[in-house]
């Protein structure tokens, strides 16, 4: 664009130089050139000459007018065609803008990873708005009143050194441009309500040998949370519904989970954990891919006889996911828990 | 390369009015962040009100918040701090600063924060 330029003269934009997309717009330009009396003013958009809607108001000064202008962005400038002179005489230009104000930022979310050292705030910020736009996350202490603003984007991470005063605070996203300004709901954050707790890692499994083999899944989390309440979820590779098992966790050893599944096939597994009777999940751990053993003997497979883990506290249920494309993508799929039966073609988040 | 000079500052009885003017030359085109910052002896700077130019929102340090008032003069490059009611503990030099470009998560009213800074005023509220 344009940023320092030496005018002969002036160019001025209504409604201004940043208005919002799909305004109609006029752009001025007034020559003060010595020793030209211009035979014709002439407008540029990017670079290249500009033919309609243009009028000469008076000797020294000319408008182009766009109906709708919908470019985020434009270069505009005007030169003077003098008599006597080979080439056009610049005498003006402006960078303009067009864009939206932006929307008020939503689902605004709070959570602090557990050995992290941060408070990290994410939301929606809508739809584009084409030009520079801040976010600024306002955080108040409900016990002293102190409030904090950190600039942001679409995320904030604030450190917890500096959240030592209170427990109990107020967080909300404002986000402002040029064209307008929009607060996000409050959002009511107790610190220790808000902890995810560390990275729970599927490490191994295996398939013993038995009559009736059973898998063994172990998994492991560095928590020092101690009552963790986790969901596994499982499948075979090839199929798109999951079976999800909930159970309690107590990581200060290794968790063993056992499992009675179909031979000779591909499972994918996946675990997440959060603290037990809080709100926020870790997300799922990475697929973690097991090939059960081959079916030894004549005992015939009876999928519908158990495949349900020997674990007290615990629940299985099943979940579709939404596509049955590239299944070794499996972090990519998602679906809704249906606790104890099957889904029925209700495809939504859960991670 | 920005140059920021403050003007405004002088004695006022406690409960009376100041206003502070910062002129500001050497921008490059694009928005800015500018505030005003205090230092009172013996006490580390702190925060009292910035803006950004782009938009029309301003924030302010706790203790200023209903009080102090921050704007501008876009055509002449001017910061202003309007202070009303003011206490014997809003003594203090002040000083404008600015900065182009903000990091992410910036405490918008930390000092270290900002690149550019004028010499200051000194503003003192008697009793």
């Known amino acids: 664009g344009i940023t320092s330029i030496n005018c002969s003269g002036d160019m001025w934009v209504e409604p201004g130089e940043i208005f919002q997309m799909g305004m109609n717009v006029s752009i001025y330009c007034q020559e003060a050139l010595k020793h030209c009396r211009p035979r014709n003013l002439y407008f540029y958009k990017n670079g290249f000459k500009e033919e309609f809607d243009i009028t000469r108001i008076n000797r020294t000064t000319a408008r182009i007018w766009y109906k709708g202008f919908s470019e985020p962005h434009a270069y505009m400038h005007c030169t003077a065609e003098c008599p006597g002179h080979f080439q056009e005489t610049l005498i003006c230009g402006k960078d303009i803008s067009s864009g939206h104000p932006p929307d008020a930022p939503s689902n605004l979310t709070c959570v602090i990873y557990e050995y992290s050292g941060n408070m990290t705030c994410t939301w929606n910020t809508g739809k584009p708005t084409y030009i520079d736009t801040k976010y600024i996350v306002h955080v108040k202490s409900l016990e002293t009143e102190e409030e904090q603003q950190y600039l942001a984007s679409s995320y904030v991470k604030i450190s917890t050194d500096s959240l030592q005063g209170s427990r109990k605070y107020l967080v909300w996203v404002q986000a402002v441009n040029s064209l307008g300004m929009e607060n996000s709901q409050q959002l009511h954050v107790h610190l220790d309500d808000i902890v995810i707790p560390s990275a729970s890692i599927i490490s191994r499994a295996e398939t013993t040998n038995d009559t009736v083999p059973k898998t063994i899944v172990y998994w492991k989390s560095k928590t020092m949370i101690e009552k963790v309440f986790c969901e596994m979820r499982y499948k075979t590779t090839t199929n798109q519904t999951w079976s999800v098992k909930e159970f309690d966790a107590n990581f200060t050893y290794v968790q063993q989970s056992e499992f009675y599944l179909e031979p000779d096939s591909k499972y994918v597994f996946q675990v997440r954990c959060q603290e037990t009777g809080k709100r926020n999940w870790q997300p799922w751990s990475s697929p973690f891919v097991h090939q059960t053993s081959q079916e030894t003997g004549k005992r015939n497979w009876q999928p519908w006889s158990s495949p349900f883990v020997h674990q007290t506290s615990q629940t299985v249920s099943q979940v579709t996911a939404k596509s049955s494309h590239e299944p070794q993508k499996m972090e990519m799929l998602s679906a809704t828990i249906f606790r104890g039966h099957p889904a029925s073609g209700n495809h939504q988040d859960i991670g | 390369q920005v140059q920021l000079q403050e003007s405004g500052g002088g004695s006022v009885q406690a409960g009376g009015s100041l206003r502070l003017s910062c002129a500001a030359s050497?921008?490059?085109?694009?928005?800015?962040?500018m505030g005003w910052f205090r230092q009172a002896p013996g006490k580390e700077r702190e925060g009292v009100a910035t803006?950004?130019?782009?938009?029309?929102?301003?924030f302010y340090g706790d203790s200023v918040k209903g009080r102090f008032t921050i704007s501008r003069d876009n055509f002449k490059n001017t910061l202003y701090l309007q202070m009303n009611s003011l206490k014997v503990e809003d003594t203090a030099m002040y000083y404008c600063?600015?900065?182009?470009?903000?990091?992410?998560?910036?405490?918008?009213?930390?000092?270290?924060?900002?690149?550019?800074w004028g010499q200051g005023t000194q503003v003192t509220v008697s009793s």
């Open positions: 600063a600015a900065d182009p470009a903000l990091r992410l998560g910036a405490n918008i009213l930390r000092p270290a924060e900002y690149k550019y």
């Open positions: 803006l950004w130019t782009g938009g029309a929102s301003t």
């Open positions: 050497g921008y490059t085109s694009g928005n800015y962040w």
